[in-house]
Interface confidence: low
């Protein structure tokens, strides 16, 4: 899908005459008919397979055609097509004299033709205009033309559809060849996959939008690289989620059983020696002259 654009620049008809050589009265009120068709080695009559367009009266005898693209869109002339551009074309431009206001073909006398040019050749899709000038014994026409792709169409022949978007189907803009270019923070074939916060753990973290790091169950921390120990774990750590590996001196399922009561509580008095003997249990060996469980007597 694309548009063949034709920019008429200048038409010279110094003597103000028709193709027959007869002068226009009072002058040649000139308008143009354009026919775009498939490539023909010899441009011949037949359907304008790629489209037609006509202009209003643009001037009398000799005149420059102003760029009216911001106004009525008359110049450049637009010939849209909705197929793959074949790379070749034939173009016919006819200049006609309008004796009155009715420009329909059936309303014009057959000898109202001023000039007719026909060109054919190759034309690649692109932004650059090709400038051409066609001269006959009586007239001269200067014009330029190009083929550009319609909005959202890309590639050498305008056949690749690509729409920039930023929604749940993808986050991208389109390159000139129609390939996707992901917006910052997105990746994947259709740019649907967010790029998580740098360093976010590959297995334990994920994200639903760029620069985010959401932790999977059992993991915590800014980068989801810290496991969450068993609920109720008191004096322990984990290397995988829900573990409770006890710190030295602690035991039990929740690492809440004190296996080193002597060090943690120093229960023995008067210089007695303390020995751990199980969970929360200990034995004090009293110095001579002292007695009691904690050698306090």
């Amino acid at each position: 899908s694309g548009v063949f654009q034709l920019q008429l620049q200048e038409f010279i008809n110094e003597r103000g005459v028709l193709a027959s050589g007869r002068p226009c009265e009072p002058g040649c009120r000139t308008f143009f008919r354009v026919c775009l068709k498939h490539f023909q080695a010899v441009v011949s009559p037949g359907p304008c397979t790629f489209g037609t367009v006509s202009t209003p009266v643009l001037g009398t005898n000799s005149f420059a055609v102003r760029d009216d693209s911001s106004g009525g869109g008359r110049n450049p002339l637009q010939l849209p097509f909705n197929f793959t551009w074949p790379g070749t074309f034939s173009l016919i431009i006819e200049a006609w004299h309008a004796p009155g206001d009715d420009l329909r073909p059936e309303a014009l006398p057959p000898d109202a033709l001023i000039s007719k040019i026909a060109i054919q050749g190759s034309l690649a899709v692109g932004q650059n205009w090709l400038l051409d000038e066609q001269t006959s014994t009586l007239t001269r026409l200067r014009y330029s033309y190009r083929v550009i792709c319609s909005d959202n169409y890309y590639g050498d022949n305008c056949s690749r559809l690509c729409k920039k978007r930023n929604d749940h189907f993808g986050h991208y803009v389109c390159q000139p060849d129609g390939n996707l270019s992901c917006l910052p923070g997105w990746t994947g074939e259709y740019c649907q996959q967010p790029i998580c916060l740098s360093g976010c753990h590959e297995q334990n973290g994920y994200c639903s939008k760029p620069a985010e790091c959401l932790c999977r169950p059992g993991w915590q921390g800014r980068l989801c690289n810290e496991c969450i120990p068993h609920n109720g774990c008191r004096h322990g750590t984990c290397s995988t989620p829900w573990q409770c590996t006890c710190d030295e001196g602690w035991g039990g399922l929740f690492c809440d059983q004190d296996l080193n009561y002597c060090t943690h509580h120093s229960p023995c008095k008067n210089g007695a020696t303390c020995s751990n003997s199980g969970q929360r249990s200990y034995t004090c060996t009293c110095r001579p002259g002292y007695t009691g469980v904690d050698c306090e007597l």
Partner: nanobody
Framework: QVQLQESGGGLVQAGGSLRLSCAAS????????MGWYRQAPGKEREFVAG???????YYADSVKGRFTISRDNAKNTVYLQMNSLKPEDTAVYYC????????????????????WGQGTQVTVSS
Amino acid sequence: QVQLQESGGGLVQAGGSLRLSCAASGSISGDVEMGWYRQAPGKEREFVAGINDGGNTYYADSVKGRFTISRDNAKNTVYLQMNSLKPEDTAVYYCAVSTTYPSYNESQYADWLAYWGQGTQVTVSS
């Protein structure tokens, strides 16, 4: 407002086929794109397949060659033909429709409205 109604889900044996349908009703204007997503228990919602208004189709790698998305523009309906189903295809399948605002501004990124269906359960037993 746009309403989406999915149908066609169910229980099927591994290797079997199902055809999901999603009918969109309500006011849809601008360029319309439709697609399917799925969500398995305990997992995030993931893209399955999409089709844009140019007829271009998109598939997740895990379903390429097995699933085919198509649409009937006249009926505003999108279909998902699922062949050679696997147990890992078990999920709730959601229909999604994306549509541009009528006042779509080319100079900015497309401003899209997204609509989601309620989902249809697909269970593939081994």
